[in-house]
Interface confidence: low
């Protein structure tokens, strides 16, 4: 059977194009190594935003020029993507793999829809 | 059967190290964590740490670093727990404990508990 | 970390009767676990990941709820029942227990 994933329905990027929330799998948090990944859906396609992994010692490292940071807690990782435009705007799905030791476990969470509003352009001054 | 064997009752000094072991068996040792949990007479319970026994690293309850060092021997399928500058405040009962499995996790199994005394 | 509140403290439930143990998280947190520890003896499980009983556990036990608050109930008591009752959360570390509930039986 599939393992559980638990993220929230729906976030507001803030005005910079940053959006942040939590990803939980129910599982023990207890892994010695778990992978994390962003994927955004947009109609029938899938694409990977973002990935990272982490052990219960090392923190979750995200490539340096990542679009997504993120901390891990037990079961619990908070993530935040950056740079978001309005043509961001769409389903992130949160995919949480529990790679080693044996058994592997996979967990798909619903989605969280994420609404990127761009700012309107600042008037020129003189 | 999932079992964890404890080792016997401990008796120390105030300033002395104790090491509890917990034996396991009727499972493959380094598919799962071993969790200690303390609990000092009357009260609640409270999670030491964990470790990996494929891997051997350790999570910590920051209340116990430095108190407490896991540890595992594969070949024996024998998790260890060492208590270092032993004082009162640390007579308790000492569980080991072990996840239902890897899907749903809980503590399923313990161990049957070592009881740690420190008197001089 | 996650601090873990249990209500009541303890109760003194009849035979028969139903008895109900509230656990409250310092924060949200995924699944709750609950423990029973009869006196001498190790925790056994009793309800994981929330709502699910474990292996051998009558079905006099459930449990239920979300967030920060949750559950714990037994429709009708029976004297085998008497113990401490515990709630665990495995949300973030470290993991951390409530701080027990004793039901004794009137």
């Known amino acids: 059977k599939g393992m559980h994933a638990a993220q929230p329905a729906v976030v507001l990027a803030s005005s910079r194009g940053v959006a942040s929330f939590v990803c939980e799998y129910g599982s023990s948090g207890n892994a010695a190594e778990v992978r994390v990944t962003m994927l955004r859906q947009a109609g029938s396609q899938m694409t990977e935003v973002c990935a990272a992994t982490y052990t219960v010692e090392d923190e979750l490292a995200f490539l340096d020029d990542s679009t997504c940071t993120g901390t891990s807690s037990g079961n619990k990782v908070n993530l935040t993507i950056q740079g978001l435009r309005a043509m961001g705007t769409g389903l992130y799905i949160c995919k949480v793999e529990l790679m080693y030791p044996p058994p592997y476990y996979v967990g798909m969470g619903n989605g969280t829809q994420i609404y990127v509003i761009d700012p309107e352009p600042c008037p020129d001054s003189d | 059967e999932v079992q964890l064997v404890q080792s016997g009752a401990e008796v120390k000094k105030p300033g002395a190290s104790v090491k509890v072991s917990c034996k396991a068996s009727?499972?493959?040792?380094?598919?799962?964590?071993m969790d200690w949990v303390r609990q000092a007479h009357g009260a609640s319970l409270d999670w030491i740490g964990n470790i990996n026994p494929n891997s051997e690293s350790t999570s910590y309850n920051q209340k116990f670093k430095g108190k407490a060092t896991l540890t595992v021997d594969k070949s024996t399928s024998t998790a260890y727990m060492e208590l270092s500058s032993l004082r009162a405040g640390d007579i308790a009962v000492y569980y080991c404990?072990?996840?239902?499995?890897?899907?749903?996790?809980?503590?399923?199994?313990w161990g049957q508990g070592t009881l740690v005394t420190v008197s001089s | 970390q996650i601090v873990m509140t249990q209500t009541p403290l303890s109760l003194s439930v009849s035979p028969g009767e139903p008895a109900s143990i509230s656990c409250s998280a310092s924060?949200?947190?995924?699944?709750m676990h609950w423990f029973q520890q009869k006196p001498g003896q190790s925790p056994q499980s009793l309800i994981y990941s929330t709502s699910i009983l474990a292996s051998g556990v009558p079905d006099r036990f459930s449990g239920s709820g979300s967030g920060t608050d949750f559950t714990l109930k037994i429709s009708r008591v029976e004297a085998d029942d008497a113990g401490v009752y515990y709630c665990q959360q495995r949300t973030s570390y470290p993991l951390t227990f409530g701080t027990g509930t004793k039901l004794e039986l009137k």
């Open positions: 009727g499972y493959t040792f380094t598919d799962y964590n």
């Open positions: 404990t072990r996840d239902g499995n890897r899907y749903d996790a809980w503590f399923a199994y």
């Open positions: 924060s949200s947190v995924t699944y």
